[in-house]
Interface confidence: low
Protein backbone atom coordinates (compact mmCIF):
# COMPACT_ATOMS: atom_id res chain seq x y z
CA UNK A 1 0.00 0.00 0.00
CA UNK A 2 1.05 3.61 -0.37
CA UNK A 3 2.08 5.77 2.58
CA UNK A 4 0.27 8.95 3.53
CA UNK A 5 1.10 11.59 6.13
CA UNK A 6 -1.25 11.92 9.10
CA UNK A 7 -0.96 14.72 11.65
CA UNK A 8 -2.47 14.89 15.12
CA UNK A 9 -1.71 16.89 18.29
CA UNK A 10 0.95 15.55 20.61
CA UNK A 11 -0.96 16.05 23.85
CA UNK A 12 -4.61 16.49 24.86
CA UNK A 13 -6.06 16.74 28.35
CA UNK A 14 -9.45 15.14 28.84
CA UNK A 15 -12.16 17.24 30.46
CA UNK A 16 -13.37 16.58 33.99
CA UNK A 17 -16.25 14.68 32.42
CA UNK A 18 -13.87 12.30 30.68
CA UNK A 19 -14.17 13.75 27.20
CA UNK A 20 -11.18 14.30 24.92
CA UNK A 21 -11.26 15.81 21.45
CA UNK A 22 -8.56 16.14 18.84
CA UNK A 23 -8.16 16.70 15.13
CA UNK A 24 -6.69 14.08 12.83
CA UNK A 25 -5.53 15.56 9.54
CA UNK A 26 -4.33 13.58 6.54
CA UNK A 27 -2.54 14.67 3.40
CA UNK A 28 -4.76 13.15 0.73
CA UNK A 29 -2.68 12.56 -2.39
CA UNK A 30 -5.74 12.31 -4.60
CA UNK A 31 -9.51 12.44 -4.67
CA UNK A 32 -10.69 10.00 -2.02
CA UNK A 33 -14.38 9.23 -1.78
CA UNK A 34 -14.35 6.56 0.89
CA UNK A 35 -12.21 7.00 3.99
CA UNK A 36 -11.78 4.76 7.01
CA UNK A 37 -10.60 6.25 10.28
CA UNK A 38 -9.46 4.05 13.14
CA UNK A 39 -8.40 5.14 16.62
CA UNK A 40 -5.85 2.87 18.25
CA UNK A 41 -4.68 3.03 21.86
CA UNK A 42 -1.14 2.16 22.77
CA UNK A 43 -0.34 1.48 26.39
CA UNK A 44 2.37 -0.73 27.84
CA UNK A 45 3.39 -1.76 24.30
CA UNK A 46 -0.12 -3.14 23.73
CA UNK A 47 -2.12 -1.73 20.84
CA UNK A 48 -5.91 -2.03 20.88
CA UNK A 49 -8.58 -0.65 18.57
CA UNK A 50 -10.74 1.93 20.31
CA UNK A 51 -13.14 2.64 17.47
CA UNK A 52 -13.39 2.85 13.71
CA UNK A 53 -15.64 4.47 11.14
CA UNK A 54 -15.87 4.38 7.36
CA UNK A 55 -17.39 7.38 5.66
CA UNK A 56 -18.01 8.76 2.22
CA UNK A 57 -16.48 12.18 1.66
CA UNK A 58 -19.03 14.87 2.40
CA UNK A 59 -20.99 12.59 4.73
CA UNK A 60 -20.84 12.24 8.48
CA UNK A 61 -18.72 9.67 10.23
CA UNK A 62 -20.81 6.83 11.56
CA UNK A 63 -19.42 4.89 14.47
CA UNK A 64 -21.20 1.90 15.95
CA UNK A 65 -24.01 2.76 18.35
CA UNK A 66 -22.09 1.48 21.35
CA UNK A 67 -18.86 3.24 20.36
CA UNK A 68 -17.20 5.67 22.74
CA UNK A 69 -16.18 7.77 19.74
CA UNK A 70 -18.00 10.40 17.74
CA UNK A 71 -16.65 12.53 14.95
CA UNK A 72 -17.17 14.92 12.10
CA UNK A 73 -15.25 15.37 8.90
CA UNK A 74 -14.32 18.47 6.97
CA UNK A 75 -12.15 18.08 3.91
CA UNK A 76 -9.04 16.22 4.94
CA UNK A 77 -9.67 16.76 8.65
CA UNK A 78 -11.49 14.49 11.04
CA UNK A 79 -12.58 15.89 14.39
CA UNK A 80 -12.63 13.01 16.85
CA UNK A 81 -14.18 12.95 20.30
CA UNK A 82 -13.69 10.11 22.75
CA UNK A 83 -16.07 9.95 25.69
CA UNK A 84 -16.30 8.06 28.96
CA UNK A 85 -12.59 8.22 29.68
CA UNK A 86 -11.17 7.49 33.12
CA UNK A 87 -7.67 7.81 34.56
CA UNK A 88 -6.90 4.23 33.62
CA UNK A 89 -7.54 5.13 29.97
CA UNK A 90 -4.59 7.52 29.87
CA UNK A 91 -2.41 6.55 26.94
CA UNK A 92 -1.28 7.24 23.41
CA UNK A 93 -4.21 7.41 20.99
CA UNK A 94 -3.14 6.86 17.39
CA UNK A 95 -5.12 7.99 14.37
CA UNK A 96 -5.01 5.61 11.43
CA UNK A 97 -6.46 6.77 8.12
CA UNK A 98 -7.12 4.60 5.07
CA UNK A 99 -8.21 5.94 1.71
CA UNK A 100 -10.36 3.04 0.62
CA UNK A 101 -11.71 4.15 -2.73
CA UNK A 102 -10.95 4.76 -5.47
CA UNK A 103 -7.63 2.95 -5.85
CA UNK A 104 -4.81 3.08 -5.15
CA UNK A 105 -5.19 2.34 -1.45
CA UNK A 106 -3.37 4.70 0.90
CA UNK A 107 -2.55 4.12 4.53
CA UNK A 108 -1.44 6.75 7.02
CA UNK A 109 -0.73 6.41 10.71
CA UNK A 110 -0.22 9.40 12.98
CA UNK A 111 2.39 9.64 15.71
CA UNK A 112 -0.33 9.53 18.32
CA UNK A 113 -1.94 11.92 20.77
CA UNK A 114 -1.12 11.42 24.42
CA UNK A 115 -4.43 11.78 26.23
CA UNK A 116 -4.22 12.43 29.93
CA UNK A 117 -7.28 11.64 31.98
CA UNK A 118 -7.60 12.67 35.61
CA UNK A 119 -10.49 11.27 37.57
CA UNK A 120 -12.36 14.11 39.29
CA UNK A 121 -12.05 14.34 43.07
CA UNK A 122 -15.29 13.27 44.76
CA UNK A 123 -17.22 16.18 46.20
CA UNK A 124 -16.72 16.41 49.97
CA UNK A 125 -19.79 15.84 52.11
CA UNK A 126 -21.41 19.07 53.15
CA UNK A 127 -23.00 19.67 56.52
CA UNK A 128 -25.61 22.39 56.65
Amino acid sequence: CKAMHVAQPAVVLASSRGIASFVCEYASPGKATEVRVTVLRQADSQVTEVCAATYMMGNELTFLDDSICTGTSSGNQVNLTIQGLRAMDTGLYICKVELMYPPPYYLGIGNGTQIYVIDPEPCPDSDF
Epitope: C1, K2, T33, P103, P104
Partner: antibody, heavy 124, light 108 residues
Protein backbone atom coordinates in the same frame (compact mmCIF):
# COMPACT_ATOMS: atom_id res chain seq x y z
CA UNK B 1 -24.30 -18.32 -1.71
CA UNK B 2 -24.26 -14.92 -3.39
CA UNK B 3 -25.79 -14.83 -6.86
CA UNK B 4 -26.01 -12.07 -9.45
CA UNK B 5 -28.43 -12.14 -12.36
CA UNK B 6 -28.46 -9.74 -15.30
CA UNK B 7 -31.72 -8.94 -17.06
CA UNK B 8 -32.75 -6.71 -19.93
CA UNK B 9 -33.42 -6.69 -23.67
CA UNK B 10 -31.07 -8.70 -25.85
CA UNK B 11 -31.53 -6.44 -28.86
CA UNK B 12 -31.15 -2.67 -28.96
CA UNK B 13 -31.35 -0.39 -31.97
CA UNK B 14 -28.47 1.92 -32.88
CA UNK B 15 -28.61 5.35 -31.20
CA UNK B 16 -30.98 4.03 -28.53
CA UNK B 17 -30.25 3.39 -24.86
CA UNK B 18 -29.20 0.00 -23.53
CA UNK B 19 -30.68 -0.74 -20.10
CA UNK B 20 -29.72 -3.68 -17.89
CA UNK B 21 -30.46 -4.59 -14.30
CA UNK B 22 -28.47 -6.82 -11.98
CA UNK B 23 -30.38 -8.51 -9.17
CA UNK B 24 -28.34 -9.62 -6.17
CA UNK B 25 -29.55 -12.54 -4.07
CA UNK B 26 -27.99 -14.30 -1.11
CA UNK B 27 -26.49 -11.09 0.23
CA UNK B 28 -27.21 -7.43 0.77
CA UNK B 29 -26.24 -4.84 -1.80
CA UNK B 30 -26.09 -2.36 1.09
CA UNK B 31 -23.04 -3.97 2.66
CA UNK B 32 -20.35 -1.36 3.26
CA UNK B 33 -17.66 -3.87 2.33
CA UNK B 34 -18.44 -4.11 -1.38
CA UNK B 35 -18.88 -2.23 -4.60
CA UNK B 36 -20.86 -3.46 -7.57
CA UNK B 37 -19.67 -3.26 -11.12
CA UNK B 38 -20.41 -3.80 -14.78
CA UNK B 39 -17.96 -5.39 -17.22
CA UNK B 40 -18.52 -6.17 -20.87
CA UNK B 41 -16.96 -8.52 -23.41
CA UNK B 42 -17.44 -8.08 -27.16
CA UNK B 43 -17.77 -11.43 -29.00
CA UNK B 44 -14.39 -13.14 -29.22
CA UNK B 45 -12.62 -10.29 -27.43
CA UNK B 46 -11.37 -9.34 -23.97
CA UNK B 47 -12.96 -7.79 -20.89
CA UNK B 48 -13.67 -4.09 -20.41
CA UNK B 49 -14.64 -2.50 -17.10
CA UNK B 50 -17.58 -0.14 -17.55
CA UNK B 51 -18.03 1.23 -14.05
CA UNK B 52 -18.76 0.57 -10.39
CA UNK B 53 -21.19 1.82 -7.77
CA UNK B 54 -21.32 1.90 -3.98
CA UNK B 55 -24.61 1.30 -2.20
CA UNK B 56 -24.69 4.98 -1.24
CA UNK B 57 -24.79 5.87 -4.92
CA UNK B 58 -21.17 6.92 -5.48
CA UNK B 59 -20.17 5.94 -9.00
CA UNK B 60 -16.90 5.39 -10.85
CA UNK B 61 -16.90 5.15 -14.64
CA UNK B 62 -14.44 4.16 -17.32
CA UNK B 63 -13.45 7.47 -18.96
CA UNK B 64 -13.82 5.89 -22.40
CA UNK B 65 -17.56 5.42 -21.75
CA UNK B 66 -18.26 8.05 -19.10
CA UNK B 67 -20.24 10.42 -21.30
CA UNK B 68 -22.72 7.65 -22.17
CA UNK B 69 -22.90 5.60 -18.97
CA UNK B 70 -25.16 5.83 -15.94
CA UNK B 71 -25.05 3.28 -13.14
CA UNK B 72 -27.63 3.45 -10.38
CA UNK B 73 -28.57 1.40 -7.34
CA UNK B 74 -31.90 0.47 -5.75
CA UNK B 75 -31.16 -0.89 -2.28
CA UNK B 76 -34.83 -1.63 -1.61
CA UNK B 77 -34.84 -4.12 -4.49
CA UNK B 78 -31.24 -5.25 -3.99
CA UNK B 79 -30.50 -4.26 -7.56
CA UNK B 80 -28.15 -2.05 -9.52
CA UNK B 81 -28.57 -0.97 -13.11
CA UNK B 82 -26.66 0.08 -16.19
CA UNK B 83 -27.72 2.52 -18.86
CA UNK B 84 -25.60 3.09 -21.95
CA UNK B 85 -26.89 5.74 -24.32
CA UNK B 86 -26.36 6.31 -28.04
CA UNK B 87 -25.33 2.73 -28.66
CA UNK B 88 -23.63 1.54 -31.81
CA UNK B 89 -22.65 -1.83 -33.23
CA UNK B 90 -19.37 -1.62 -31.29
CA UNK B 91 -21.39 -1.86 -28.07
CA UNK B 92 -22.52 -5.38 -28.97
CA UNK B 93 -21.16 -7.54 -26.15
CA UNK B 94 -21.88 -9.89 -23.31
CA UNK B 95 -22.55 -7.65 -20.30
CA UNK B 96 -21.63 -8.97 -16.86
CA UNK B 97 -22.46 -7.60 -13.45
CA UNK B 98 -20.08 -8.43 -10.62
CA UNK B 99 -19.29 -7.76 -6.99
CA UNK B 100 -16.17 -5.74 -6.29
CA UNK B 101 -14.50 -6.87 -3.09
CA UNK B 102 -11.76 -5.16 -1.15
CA UNK B 103 -8.84 -6.96 0.45
CA UNK B 104 -7.71 -5.13 3.57
CA UNK B 105 -4.42 -7.01 3.64
CA UNK B 106 -3.11 -5.36 0.50
CA UNK B 107 -5.64 -2.73 -0.45
CA UNK B 108 -6.53 -4.52 -3.67
CA UNK B 109 -9.91 -4.68 -5.38
CA UNK B 110 -11.17 -7.65 -7.34
CA UNK B 111 -14.31 -9.07 -8.94
CA UNK B 112 -15.15 -12.14 -6.88
CA UNK B 113 -18.75 -12.91 -7.89
CA UNK B 114 -20.08 -12.61 -11.43
CA UNK B 115 -23.43 -12.93 -13.10
CA UNK B 116 -23.65 -15.40 -15.98
CA UNK B 117 -23.72 -12.53 -18.46
CA UNK B 118 -26.28 -11.38 -20.99
CA UNK B 119 -25.63 -10.85 -24.69
CA UNK B 120 -26.80 -7.50 -25.98
CA UNK B 121 -26.80 -7.04 -29.73
CA UNK B 122 -26.97 -3.59 -31.26
CA UNK B 123 -28.67 -3.84 -34.63
CA UNK B 124 -31.48 -2.26 -36.57
CA UNK C 1 -4.86 4.36 -18.37
CA UNK C 2 -2.66 1.39 -17.50
CA UNK C 3 -2.32 -1.04 -20.39
CA UNK C 4 -2.00 -4.72 -19.49
CA UNK C 5 -0.22 -6.98 -21.99
CA UNK C 6 -0.36 -10.75 -21.69
CA UNK C 7 1.92 -13.30 -23.28
CA UNK C 8 1.80 -15.59 -25.00
CA UNK C 9 -1.51 -15.10 -26.78
CA UNK C 10 -1.89 -18.87 -27.01
CA UNK C 11 -0.13 -21.57 -25.02
CA UNK C 12 -0.33 -25.19 -26.11
CA UNK C 13 0.48 -27.74 -23.41
CA UNK C 14 -0.47 -31.23 -22.32
CA UNK C 15 -2.22 -32.28 -19.11
CA UNK C 16 0.27 -32.71 -16.30
CA UNK C 17 2.63 -30.06 -17.66
CA UNK C 18 3.47 -26.76 -15.98
CA UNK C 19 1.99 -23.58 -17.42
CA UNK C 20 3.52 -20.14 -17.01
CA UNK C 21 1.46 -17.15 -18.12
CA UNK C 22 2.86 -13.62 -18.14
CA UNK C 23 1.25 -10.25 -17.65
CA UNK C 24 3.03 -6.92 -18.03
CA UNK C 25 1.71 -3.50 -16.98
CA UNK C 26 2.57 -0.31 -18.87
CA UNK C 27 3.49 1.27 -15.52
CA UNK C 28 4.16 -0.04 -12.05
CA UNK C 29 1.13 -1.40 -10.22
CA UNK C 30 3.09 -2.14 -7.06
CA UNK C 31 3.12 -5.64 -5.63
CA UNK C 32 -0.52 -6.04 -4.73
CA UNK C 33 -2.85 -4.60 -7.28
CA UNK C 34 -3.20 -7.46 -9.71
CA UNK C 35 -5.79 -10.22 -10.14
CA UNK C 36 -6.07 -13.25 -12.38
CA UNK C 37 -9.28 -14.70 -13.84
CA UNK C 38 -10.11 -17.90 -15.67
CA UNK C 39 -12.82 -17.98 -18.33
CA UNK C 40 -14.10 -21.21 -19.80
CA UNK C 41 -16.10 -21.14 -23.07
CA UNK C 42 -19.62 -19.82 -22.58
CA UNK C 43 -19.02 -19.00 -18.90
CA UNK C 44 -18.38 -15.88 -16.85
CA UNK C 45 -14.83 -15.21 -15.67
CA UNK C 46 -13.85 -16.78 -12.35
CA UNK C 47 -11.51 -15.13 -9.86
CA UNK C 48 -8.33 -17.15 -9.29
CA UNK C 49 -5.80 -14.82 -7.67
CA UNK C 50 -6.04 -11.37 -6.09
CA UNK C 51 -3.43 -9.17 -4.48
CA UNK C 52 -0.96 -10.67 -7.00
CA UNK C 53 -0.47 -13.87 -5.01
CA UNK C 54 -3.50 -14.67 -2.81
CA UNK C 55 -5.63 -17.57 -4.01
CA UNK C 56 -9.37 -16.94 -4.02
CA UNK C 57 -11.68 -19.19 -2.03
CA UNK C 58 -11.94 -22.67 -3.48
CA UNK C 59 -9.08 -22.30 -5.94
CA UNK C 60 -6.76 -25.34 -6.03
CA UNK C 61 -3.19 -25.01 -4.78
CA UNK C 62 -1.81 -25.77 -8.25
CA UNK C 63 -2.61 -22.14 -9.15
CA UNK C 64 -0.12 -19.57 -7.89
CA UNK C 65 0.57 -15.93 -8.63
CA UNK C 66 3.76 -13.94 -8.29
CA UNK C 67 5.41 -10.73 -9.38
CA UNK C 68 5.50 -7.04 -8.58
CA UNK C 69 5.96 -3.71 -10.26
CA UNK C 70 5.23 -4.28 -13.93
CA UNK C 71 5.78 -8.03 -14.35
CA UNK C 72 3.44 -10.70 -13.02
CA UNK C 73 3.14 -14.44 -13.53
CA UNK C 74 0.38 -17.00 -13.13
CA UNK C 75 1.69 -20.53 -12.73
CA UNK C 76 -0.33 -23.74 -12.96
CA UNK C 77 1.93 -26.44 -11.57
CA UNK C 78 0.31 -29.49 -13.14
CA UNK C 79 -2.37 -28.92 -15.74
CA UNK C 80 -5.71 -30.65 -15.33
CA UNK C 81 -8.19 -31.08 -18.22
CA UNK C 82 -10.50 -28.41 -16.73
CA UNK C 83 -7.67 -25.84 -16.71
CA UNK C 84 -7.72 -25.35 -20.48
CA UNK C 85 -9.41 -21.97 -20.83
CA UNK C 86 -8.64 -18.28 -21.34
CA UNK C 87 -6.83 -16.42 -18.55
CA UNK C 88 -7.00 -12.68 -17.94
CA UNK C 89 -4.96 -10.44 -15.67
CA UNK C 90 -6.46 -7.21 -14.30
CA UNK C 91 -4.97 -4.24 -12.48
CA UNK C 92 -6.74 -2.26 -9.79
CA UNK C 93 -3.92 0.14 -9.00
CA UNK C 94 -5.68 2.98 -10.76
CA UNK C 95 -9.02 3.68 -12.33
CA UNK C 96 -10.05 2.64 -14.86
CA UNK C 97 -9.59 -1.01 -14.00
CA UNK C 98 -8.00 -2.63 -17.04
CA UNK C 99 -7.66 -6.23 -18.19
CA UNK C 100 -5.09 -7.91 -20.36
CA UNK C 101 -6.19 -9.24 -23.74
CA UNK C 102 -6.06 -12.80 -22.43
CA UNK C 103 -3.95 -15.93 -22.87
CA UNK C 104 -5.66 -18.96 -24.35
CA UNK C 105 -4.41 -22.17 -22.79
CA UNK C 106 -5.15 -25.04 -25.16
CA UNK C 107 -4.52 -28.76 -25.18
CA UNK C 108 -1.52 -29.76 -27.24
Amino acid sequence: QLQLQESGPGLVKPSETLSLTCTVSGGSISSSSYYWGWIRQPPGKGLEWIGSIYYSGSTYYNPSLKSRVTISVDTSKNQFSLELSSVAAADTAVYYCARVSYYYGSGSYYFDYWGQGTLVTVSS
Amino acid sequence: EIVMTQSPATLSLSPGERATLSCRASQSVSSSYLSWYQQRPGQAPRLLIYGASTRATGIPARFSGSGSGTDFTLTISSLQPEDFAVYYCQQDYNLPYTFGQGTKLEIK
